[in-house]
């Protein structure tokens, strides 16, 4: 039987254990909000806050700046004195709920669970390539603000998401905070709101609009504002809610929440629900129709999406896309599928999924039953009726209060379930060339840079490592600063490349001159690197053949061996098929004829795996002694391949010469009939890929072989006669003169 | 290099007003952080009023919140100072002065504002 | 308000000596906001050391600013004849900003 080279598994040619050490900064305490700044004079800074602190930090991560947030009450909180002699509410530790950056002025905002969630404007002053943060201004108006009526009252200690829009001269702050009945009767926050923040940045100026849960389903209904995000003319707000305000408050789904970004006014705000889901290729019995529901948002993050990524999702290059990571619960740990699953939902077809519900509520003729929803917001009613009310009245407008679309958008996993038992915590999404790359942190503290494509059924890593020995969960938001992201763990934040932080990981030369080009990875004589890590050597067009293994470990010292060789690295093409004169193999001092590929042998192999198998035909020369030797491949003049041309040597120890004796046959005689089983007895008698025993001429079957042994069956004989016997090994005679006698039957 | 030169000092009565101008030149006006201080004839030094880069942020000390205002025109690169209600306690030399976080990096030479019926 | 008091209020020395001049806050100023000033008689006021322990652009190794909390230091290693002058501190780390009342260093 044919010996085949076994499979090397494809992760065999990474190693994702890999240590690599990346630019950090300890903050001195749990990280609770990091934001980035890039001005247009090449000054860069880092925001990054925890409890009572905010720092600023350079490009490099070193430390520019700081100042006390906190505690409220305390003579050191340098923002607390900045609105001036208190008391100002009851004192206590600031956790930085929101951290945004005003792109206008350009100024900083921070506001904290402290002093009514009032926030604080820091003007930026770039001085080099530094910047640092004005003397703090409070945003909080005494004589404005009432514990009904507050409308500088931003952060609920519950947590908030802002976003930031510039309207003409002014600054509207999309709010959207997470309420129960404590938060809510203390100084009156709204779920939802929209607010332009006063010129003299003295607060923000009362009488803005806004949606809050309704006094009596505050204790039930929850929300949680997972993301937000602003792109072309909305403002976007990620929610994860009960799905419905009468059932089960803790069956969660998504929501996706649209305000306009032109208009500060919230009467076409609308919600849609999102609906990520993993449908595995092959169904198990009793899953669910459609795949199985991971309803609950982890991360989300949008991007605009390279070429590869938009054909598969039907969209131009370039069009943003919203990507979710999505759990199955509130716990994230499911019973059956993979921990996380990834959905992405390209912002137009969001867009027009919500126009056109806004059409099936309002246009007629009027669809029974259909409910306007967001009870949990408003009064119940039905479309096209305002919220509350049985009828339209002549001047309002269907179209002017806000709307749950009734259809909900529905996408499967893009990594079709690769993701396994890994939990998402962070993501990221960048273009890279043509790439879409996603950047995941996980709950165990590691970095994941995934290229974000549809059609495979395995991971295509940039890069997988972790980012310390801490091991502790990398938190919800990421951001960016030139060619880098910004994660945070735990009291770090640390600076990643979005290109990967090296090479290292990729083990073969094959693997490393694959990667992707914006990787910059090269090979340095044994290991991948980039350029940096060794200029001597490095190079990115070619790759020597790698054997890794090959058969048979001997051969005769006279007569041919069809060797085997495995490796990676022999031809760059599928078809395996050698242009004259590029191979050359040779064992010893003996050269080895390369054979033509049998195509019938020729067998597909999958990504997930790969080896390739070169055969030739090893004819020792006379000059061949007995003994071990190396086996070498040499490659040149290979014309090149998609990503490298094959150039160079790989040489194997372990193979051996040996010369085949044969001391002893019996029985020296047996039935005309055939059909006698021989024993031949000897020395590397199983050396090489062939041997025959000829009886007359005619070959002997063999049903054994050992070193030492050879069974085999006698043909049948022509005539009673003494009749030569011999042993031929590689097509070589073994020495030795040998009879076997033929009798009557 | 960097320069800063005040203007519009001089002799008031009780109650008038004046208004000081600082002109900066020489480094990027609108990225620094400018204070007004006094300093009394044969007194210390007194911060008066701060202003940030983009004007979000002004401060002033407690004797002469609610008569001064400190404001600033980066497409001019001038400081103001419009003093009102003045009274003979705010007679001294103004000194303009860049910068915050790095302390108050440069000065002007200063110009004496007289208050005296 | 954050209050800085000064001492001595006046310090007699000869050239070549070293001169150790304290500041005291009424509360913690963080060592970040900490500015010395010296001024000479008819000119403004010159930043020596900012952040508590800077050396501002252009000025002599000489000068050395120490200390955190409450308690910060300058000290003149070797004094010049163009040293004598009025020096003041100032912390910057709360509104109001205020400063010191001043150290008049004199030759003896």
């Known amino acids: 039987e044919d010996w085949q080279c076994p499979r090397t598994p494809y992760a065999a040619s990474r190693d994702f254990d890999v240590k690599y050490v990346v630019p950090s900064f300890s903050a001195g305490g749990l990280v609770q909000a990091m934001v980035t700044y890039e001005g247009d004079r090449n000054e860069s800074a880092v925001f990054v806050a925890i409890r009572n602190r905010l720092h600023v930090l350079g490009p490099d991560l070193k430390s520019v700046q700081s100042l006390a947030t906190g505690p409220a009450g305390d003579p050191g909180c340098q923002t607390c004195a900045a609105c001036g002699p208190g008391p100002h509410g009851p004192p206590g530790d600031t956790d930085t709920k929101v951290l945004v950056l005003d792109p206008a002025l350009p100024a900083l905002v921070s506001c904290g669970s402290s002093l009514q969630g009032r926030c604080f404007l820091h003007d930026l002053e770039p001085q080099g390539t530094a910047v640092h943060l004005a003397a703090p201004a409070c945003l909080f108006s005494a004589h404005h603000n009432r514990p009904d009526d507050c409308p500088d009252c931003v952060a609920s200690p519950l947590g908030t998401r802002v976003t930031v829009v510039e309207q003409g001269q002014a600054s509207y702050f999309y709010v959207a905070s997470s309420l129960d009945a404590a938060v809510a009767a203390s100084f009156s926050p709204r779920s939802v709101s929209i607010r332009r923040l006063k010129a003299d940045a003295s607060g923000f100026a009362p009488g803005f609009v806004a949606l809050s849960v309704l006094p009596k389903h505050l204790v039930s209904y929850s929300i949680e504002y997972v993301h937000s995000f602003h792109t072309g003319a909305f403002v976007y707000f990620l929610t994860v809610q009960p799905a419905s305000v009468t059932d089960d408050p803790s069956a969660l789904h998504t929501r996706l929440a649209r305000l306009s970004a032109t208009e500060p006014e919230l009467g076409d705000y609308r919600e849609l629900v999102l609906d990520c889901r993993f449908a595995p290729k092959r169904r198990r019995r009793g899953a669910p129709e459609g795949g199985q529901p991971y309803p609950v948002l982890r991360v989300a993050h949008s991007a605009p999406v390279g070429a590869q990524l938009a054909t598969e999702l039907s969209i131009a290059e370039g069009q943003e896309v919203l990507f979710g990571v999505f759990v199955t619960g509130k716990d994230g740990g499911p019973g059956v599928g993979p921990n996380s699953v990834v959905c992405a939902f390209p912002i137009d077809l969001l867009d027009t999924l919500i126009d056109e519900g806004v059409e099936r509520c309002c246009e007629s003729p009027v669809h029974p039953g259909l409910r306007r929803g967001l009870d949990f917001f408003q009064s119940p009613s039905f479309c096209p009726n305002p919220p509350g009310l049985e009828a339209l009245s002549p001047n309002t407008s269907c179209r002017h209060f806000p709307l749950l679309v009734s259809s909900s958008f529905s996408r499967v996993d893009l990594f079709n379930g690769l993701l396994g038992p890994v939990q998402v915590t962070a993501l990221y999404v960048t273009r890279l060339d043509n790439v879409t790359v996603a950047h995941m942190g996980t709950m165990d503290g590691r970095i994941l840079q995934v290229e974000l494509v549809r059609s495979l059924n395995y991971l295509l890593y940039v890069s997988n490592f972790s980012l310390g020995d801490s091991g502790q969960p990398v938190q919800r938001d990421v951001s960016r600063l030139g060619d880098h992201l910004l994660f945070a763990s735990g009291d770090q934040v640390f600076q990643v490349p979005i290109q990967g932080p090296g090479c290292r990981h990729f083990l073969t030369c094959g693997r490393c001159l694959r990667a992707w080009h914006f990787m910059g990875c090269g090979w340095c004589g044994n290991m991948c690197g980039q350029q940096k890590e060794c200029p001597g050597s490095w190079q990115q067009d070619h790759c020597p053949p790698k054997l890794t293994e090959f058969h048979p470990h001997s051969g005769p010292l006279r007569g041919s061996t069809r060797l085997t060789l495995c490796g990676s690295n022999f031809y760059l093409h599928p078809s395996g098929l050698v242009p004259e004169g590029t191979h050359q193999v040779t064992v010893g001092q003996s050269p080895c004829r390369p054979l033509p590929k049998d195509s019938s042998k020729l067998r597909p192999v999958p990504r997930k795996d790969f080896v390739e198998e070169f055969e030739c035909e090893l004819e020792p020369l006379g000059t061949q002694a007995v003994g071990p030797t190396n086996v070498s491949l040499t490659v040149t003049n290979m014309p090149p391949g998609k990503h490298f041309r094959v150039d160079g040597t790989s040489v194997l120890r372990g193979f051996s010469f040996m010369e085949p004796v044969l001391i002893a046959v019996q029985p020296l005689f047996g039935p005309r009939a055939g059909g006698t089983c021989l024993t031949l007895e000897g020395q590397s008698l199983s050396v090489g890929t062939s041997r025959a025993v000829l009886v007359n001429g005619t070959e002997c079957l063999l049903a054994r072989v050992s070193e030492g042994q050879l069974l085999c069956a006698t043909p049948p004989g022509a005539t009673v006669a003494s009749v030569p016997l011999s042993l031929q090994v590689g097509g070589a005679q073994v020495p030795g003169s040998w009879t076997f006698q033929y009798r009557e039957d | 290099q960097v320069q800063l030169v005040e203007s519009g000092g001089g002799l008031v009565q009780p109650g008038g007003s004046l208004r000081l101008s600082c002109a900066a030149s020489g480094f990027t006006f609108n990225s620094y952080s400018m204070s007004w201080v006094r300093q009394a004839p044969g007194k210390g030094l007194e911060w008066v009023s701060y202003?940030?880069?983009?004007?979000?942020?002004?401060y002033y000390a407690d004797s002469v919140k609610g008569r001064f205002t400190i404001s600033r025109d980066n497409s001019k690169n001038t400081l103001y100072l419009q003093m009102n209600s003045l009274r003979a306690e705010d007679t001294a030399v103004y000194y303009c002065?860049?910068?915050?976080?790095?302390?108050?990096?440069?000065w002007g030479q200063g110009t004496l504002v007289t208050v005296s019926s | 308000d954050i209050v800085l008091t000064q001492s001595p209020a006046t310090l007699s020395l000869s050239p070549g000596e070293r001169a150790t001049l304290s500041c005291r806050a009424s509360?913690?100023?963080?060592?970040?906001?900490l500015g010395w000033y010296q001024q000479k008689p008819g000119q403004a006021p010159r930043l020596l050391i900012y952040g508590a322990s800077n050396r501002a652009t252009g000025v002599p190794a000489r000068f050395s600013g120490s200390g955190s909390g409450t308690d910060f230091t300058l000290t003149i290693s070797s004094l010049e004849p163009e040293d004598f002058a009025t020096y003041y501190c100032q912390q910057y780390y709360n509104m109001p900003y205020t400063f010191g009342q001043g150290t008049k260093v004199e030759i003896k």
């Open positions: 509360q913690s100023v963080s060592f970040d906001y």
């Open positions: 202003i940030s880069s983009r004007s979000s942020t002004t």
């Open positions: 002065a860049r910068g915050y976080f790095h302390g108050m990096d440069y």
